[in-house]
């Protein structure tokens, strides 16, 4: 069985999620990469992806999501700026490698966004809200269309564990029904 781990991030509205997904440099440097959300009982949904082939350290922006693929470091950097409560959920990075199925990168990200104080008051109109306005100068890449080859399975359950320290991991064992999403060009 596949052992999946999650890292939990608890942030406030208006803050930035800034994470990395490591990949094997020689194997995947120029492969197209994507940032997906996994909602319970649904297929993973691609929110943003790099260009094809993926360009080195070339920012790709889709709405509030910014992807940067650092080929020389073997990592995909994902930033979600000006977070909203609705952004809460389980996320993952994948590598598109047609005609093969996408390759999932570890670890998954459990994002919890709450209202309230995020360094600067967010709800008070008289105060300065920590909302970063992104200049629309980056590239918006088109992500491949995909479909599930079989019935949608239940996504990993939301953790009820108390994850209070940054080092905490949620270990999901016996997850054999990971959704594989082949790419159709």
């Amino acid at each position: 069985a596949t052992k999946l781990t999650e890292e939990k991030y608890e942030l406030k509205e208006g803050q930035t999620l800034d994470v990395k997904c490591d990949y094997t440099l020689e194997k995947f440097a120029s492969s197209q990469k994507a940032w997906q959300i996994i909602r319970d009982g649904e297929m993973p949904k691609t929110l943003a992806c790099t260009e094809r082939p993926s360009k080195n350290s070339h920012p790709v922006q889709v709405g509030r999501i910014i992807l940067e693929d650092y080929h020389d470091h073997g990592l995909l950097r994902v930033r979600m700026v000006n977070l909203q409560v609705e952004d809460s959920g389980l996320y993952q990075c994948v590598i598109y490698q047609p005609p093969k199925e996408p390759h999932m990168l570890f670890d998954r990200i459990r994002l919890v966004v709450t209202k309230g104080f995020s360094g600067t008051p967010g709800s008070n109109e008289n105060s300065t809200q920590n909302v970063y306005k992104i200049p629309p100068t980056t590239t918006k890449a088109l992500c491949p269309l995909y479909t599930s080859p079989r019935t949608v399975t239940q996504a990993p359950p939301k953790s009820t564990a108390d994850v209070s320290t940054p080092d905490s991991e949620i270990n999901l064992t016996n997850v054999t029904d990971i959704i594989r999403v082949p790419v159709f060009n």
Partner: antibody, heavy 121, light 105 residues
Framework: QVQLVQSGAEVKKPGASVKVSCKAS????????IHWVRQAPGQGLEWMGW????????NYAQKFQGRVTMTRDTSISTAYMELSRLRSDDTAVYYC??????????????WGQGTLVTVSS | SYELTQPPSVSVSPGQTASITCSGD??????VSWYQQKPGQSPVLVIY???KRPSGIPERFSGSKSGNTATLTISGTQAMDEADYYC????????FGGGTKLTVL
Amino acid sequence: QVQLVQSGAEVKKPGASVKVSCKASGYTFNGYYIHWVRQAPGQGLEWMGWLNPNSGGANYAQKFQGRVTMTRDTSISTAYMELSRLRSDDTAVYYCARDQRKTTVTPFEYWGQGTLVTVSS
Amino acid sequence: SYELTQPPSVSVSPGQTASITCSGDKLGERQVSWYQQKPGQSPVLVIYQDNKRPSGIPERFSGSKSGNTATLTISGTQAMDEADYYCQAWDRNVVFGGGTKLTVL
């Protein structure tokens, strides 16, 4: 608990090389980046680069490109930083530090005790 | 190359509030960390993700960010808080601010 233990102080002559070690314990060594940061006497913190222990890949600050090499020996959970062509202004305390999480590059939650490298003729 | 700017020094009386700023281009879309360093010691993480405190860090330490400026605030400053403080962010590489010497008068 997580610990990073560094090798002892070194005295080197200009033009020589130095190799500092950082032994990790209390966690899975492969899972977290190791960074190297130096601090010259009376100066601030200067990031030198990171090492991905899983792949062995490294990323160096531009200032040190061509002079620094970061490696690891996973069998003994130890990271190394070698700096060559030493100059007197390389005299500094050299720290190794570990990422807080697997999925981030910063912050550095755990630090070694530091290794003083003195470059003098 | 990316730079983070801090004031070289800040002075505060015991019991008062000390504020140390850190500014940088596009800091609004980056997460900021703060470190405390006392003479002869390794740095200690005091704030991460703009405003979170690691366990063991006193509640008097707090962080905030507005636009492209991050602020470390120490309320009810104590003599033991006298140290150098560094901000940090990740651009393409990891960057530290120049450091601020906090003096408790």
